[in-house]
């Protein structure tokens, strides 16, 4: 059962796993949610009745029954983890804590103009977990405006104390605001020879990489595959760090794979969600329950629905045994990973999907698309919406993309002459315009947010957000697309598609069926040559065939240029402008979304 509210002056008795320090009960709840075993917590707020050494303690707790006895205690705040909840969860914490000093290893000290600048510095520093900033009112002159970057083994402070005229806060890496590079490559036959901060068991290098990503101290990893010569090290995932933030030595070793933490690309790839099944593989761990199940998929469902289950092993039924049902072993461990992985015993293993909600919804795999053809099929582009105006009559105005459960990203130029958001209607999950009838449900628009530097499409900043009046329930036919990570600026996308209901030639009409076209990206230098009368800025991105023939056109505006990278679709561009449609040597010009990620997050995450 999902309980989100906090219980004031209440303490949960027993069940302690560990104690950490957090600046608020709200953040204690987040820490509990991300901890592999924590189901409940008790936080101690600052209070004259409480020993100051206990202030800001966050005691993480577990219980077989998923609850613990409650005791009245002043200044104690208790609650439950969000593991029990189905809603989207984020570790992003933008709060600034006034007059609090969050203790950790102070590894970098520099002058900063403001707390915001200090937080940005922390976000863009590979080691930084949190910071403390001495304001200009700080008593000690030599410490004023000093920005201390800090890290700890756990990612949370080792202690928190009251200190006048300082402010503290966390790195915003988990808010997708870091400019650090996102290196997705996994290097085969490579060992990174740096200090290990931890080791866990993992079935493959991808899971190892994801574990590294959400481990606070891990910057890169080495994984020994099941063919690794040393038996005791098979399936071992070594979590590593170094002072420079990069591996100091790479050793060529067969059957080992290495890679980097995906911290800077967390918003556009799954990090917590290990959805694969591992055949002929047994995961060992503490047994939670053994239940009968028809298949390994059913077993995974059982594990997902059991809040304490972290992973499972399914042993298929022997012929005609137990009505064809196999045994489903639900398991857990102290760190969420198997204590040992065995092969050749016939089991099928996997992980709970409960943690998938900690990943961005946009990373969910969508159904395979039909290759070739220009008409789309239902569910092929579930983020694509059709934006209708009711003035003078109801009609398709522009395309748009779902980027959040209340947010559509589109082009600013779509709103020329639109006097009010009330006259707009957003339809999602639509394949054919003819499906839209008077009684078709739609999302009303609460607010149109146009980039304040927008003047006209050709001069850039052609980007707008629509805040919907109600939230979108994600389904197979309507779900968000990932924004590109700022750390992905140098990625070369090779699988890009433009979609929309727009014209198929310059003098035409809106199409009934959603059209799609695969279009190659064109460098900005090349694009500039084709548009000598315009300035193609780095905030624009171009796509098109040299010979023309495939392009976006009137009515496609505001829609997505979607590129698939590492099995995840990213909103790389917003259809903006071009000379004619599909003309030879006249590529389409799109708003370069990666350059607006900060703007998007600022507008969509505003309180």
């Amino acid at each position: 059962e999902c309980v989100t509210q906090l219980l004031k002056d209440t303490c949960f008795e027993g069940g302690d796993i560990t104690t950490v320090f957090t600046p608020s009960a709200k953040y204690c709840q987040v820490v509990c949610t991300y901890h592999p075993r924590c189901l409940l917590f008790t936080f101690t707020a600052e209070s004259p009745s409480e020993d100051p050494t206990r202030w800001f303690t966050c005691v993480l707790k577990d219980s077989v029954t998923e609850t613990l006895p409650r005791v009245n205690r002043t200044a104690a705040i208790s609650g439950y983890s969000f593991k029990q909840c189905s809603h989207q969860i984020s570790a992003c914490n933008k709060d600034i804590y006034v007059d609090l000093d969050m203790k950790g290893i102070n590894y970098n000290s520099s002058v900063a103009k403001s707390a915001q600048e200090c937080q940005e510095r922390c976000t863009d520093d590979v080691h930084c977990h949190f910071f403390t900033y001495a304001t200009r009112q700080f008593p000690s002159l030599e410490h004023r405006n000093i920005c201390l970057l800090k890290h700890t083994q756990t990612g949370t402070p080792t202690r928190i104390t009251k200190l006048d005229k300082v402010v503290s806060g966390f790195s915003l890496k988990s808010c997708a605001l870091s400019n650090l590079a996102c290196i997705r490559d996994i290097f085969p036959n490579t060992v990174f020879a740096d200090s290990n901060i931890d080791s866990v068991m993992a079935p493959d290098a991808f899971v190892c990489g994801r574990i590294c990503t959400h481990h606070p101290g891990c910057l890169f990893f080495t994984f020994f595959s099941q063919e690794w010569p040393k038996e005791s090290q098979r399936n071992l995932c070594l979590l590593k760090t170094s002072e420079s933030g990069l591996p100091s030595t790479r050793i060529k070793k067969s059957k080992a794979l290495s890679g980097f933490s995906l911290q800077s690309c967390r918003h556009s790839i799954p990090v917590f969600c290990h959805s694969s099944f591992y055949h002929d593989t047994d995961f060992l761990g503490e047994e939670l329950d053994i239940v009968a199940a028809k298949s390994h998929e059913a077993c995974q469902k059982l594990c997902t629905n059991a809040v304490r289950c972290q992973f499972f092993t399914y042993t298929p039924a022997q012929a005609s045994c137990n009505e064809g049902k196999g045994k489903c072993y639900l398991k857990l461990s102290s760190n969420g990973s198997p204590t040992k992985i065995l092969h050749g015993r016939g089991g099928i293993s996997g992980y709970t999907l409960r943690l998938c909600k900690m990943d961005n919804e946009c990373t969910t795999k969508i159904k395979p698309r039909i290759v070739g053809g220009t008409a789309s099929v239902r569910g092929e582009w579930p983020w694509q919406v059709t934006l209708h105006t009711t003035s003078p009559t109801q009609r398709h105005l522009c395309g748009g993309s779902i980027i959040g459960n209340q947010w559509i990203l589109t082009a600013a130029h779509c709103f020329y002459g639109v006097e009010s958001p009330k006259i707009l209607r957003v339809y999602s999950g639509i394949l054919n315009q003819s499906e839209i009838k008077e009684d078709t449900s739609f999302f009303g628009v609460q607010e149109i947010i146009i980039h304040d530097q927008y003047k006209m499409a050709e001069s850039g900043y052609d980007i707008a957000l629509l805040k919907l009046e109600t939230t979108v329930n994600y389904t197979d036919s309507q779900r968000p697309i990932c924004l590109p990570s700022k750390g992905d600026r140098n990625v070369i996308y090779t699988d890009c598609w433009v979609t929309g209901w727009g014209y198929r030639k310059l003098r035409d009409k809106i199409q009934n069926t959603l059209q799609k076209a695969k279009i190659p990206l064109v460098t900005n230098e090349e694009c500039q040559k084709r548009y000598r009368g315009h300035k193609i800025t780095h905030k624009m991105i171009c796509a098109g065939y040299r010979e023309g023939g495939k392009d976006a056109c009137k009515g496609d505006s505001g829609g997505p240029l979607s590129c698939k990278h590492n099995e995840v679709w990213h909103l790389v561009g917003i259809t903006s402008w071009g000379e004619g449609c599909a003309q030879r040597e006249r590529p389409g010009v799109y708003t370069n979304v990666v350059e607006y990620v900060d703007w998007i997050l600022e507008k969509t995450q505003a309180v």
Epitope: S391, R395, E438, R507
Partner: antibody
């Protein structure tokens, strides 16, 4: 069922103003544009303007912009058109009509305005 | 402003005749054209929307066709009750405009 009921006939002197009403029922008044159309005796239809009751957004034909004022009262689901500085050529039947999904699908019965000294 | 030119301004036909009324737009209005029927002393009634879609309850002898600038209303077999004025109108862009109307009579 959808109904638009307009106020009764008006006889006005040149230079005066007239305010016509159109009471809507049977649908969500705030979600549809309400248009006003003029039909002079023996003539065709002439568009005056429209209003979106949910936001009070309006559009007018240039010819009527300075003299016609469209308003809506969402509490009573009533649209109004006020026409000022009346002259003899304003003698006509005035219709309110709802812009449905694709077209003007429901019309009021019309209000006759006669301007005569 | 988009001008809608309707022709003929009046026409007389016999019961059972096929009747055609045309409307020409001064610029491309895609298919944002409607046809209305107005009987004496009554308000206009919607017949056709989107150039070719018959409105609910309209007899199937009425049909519409055309796109861009040329539009047609056809009555496949004229009935006595079809005596009325017929108006075309465009809702592609502001200001909305109508044709001058066609008076249809029975011979």
């Amino acid at each position: 069922q959808v109904q638009l009921v307009q106020s009764g006939s008006e006889l006005k002197k040149p230079g005066a103003s007239v305010k016509l009403s159109c009471k809507a029922s049977g649908y969500t008044f705030t979600r549809y544009w309400m248009h006003w159309v003029k039909q002079a005796p023996g003539q065709g239809l002439e568009w005056i303007g429209n209003i979106y009751p949910d936001s009070d957004s309006t559009n007018y034909d240039e010819k009527f912009r300075t003299r016609a004022t469209l308003t809506a009262d969402t509490s009573t689901s009533t649209a109004y058109m006020e026409l000022s500085s009346l002259r003899s050529e304003d003698t006509a039947v005035y219709y309110c009509t709802r812009m449905g999904f694709y077209a003007m699908d429901y019309w009021g019965q019309g209000t006759t305005v006669t301007v005569s000294s | 402003n988009i001008v809608m030119t309707q022709s003929p301004s009046s026409l007389s036909a016999s019961v059972g005749d096929r009747v055609t009324i045309t409307c020409k737009a001064s610029e491309n209005v895609v298919t944002y054209v409607s046809w209305f029927q107005q009987k004496p002393g009554q308000a206009p009634k919607l017949l056709i929307y989107g150039a070719s879609n018959r409105y609910t309850g309209v007899p199937d002898r009425f049909s519409g066709s055309g796109s861009a600038t040329d539009f047609t209303l056809t009555i496949s077999s004229l009935q006595a009750e079809d005596v009325a004025d017929y108006h075309c109108g465009q809702s592609y862009s502001y200001p909305l405009t109508f044709g001058q109307g066609t008076k249809l009579e029975i011979k």
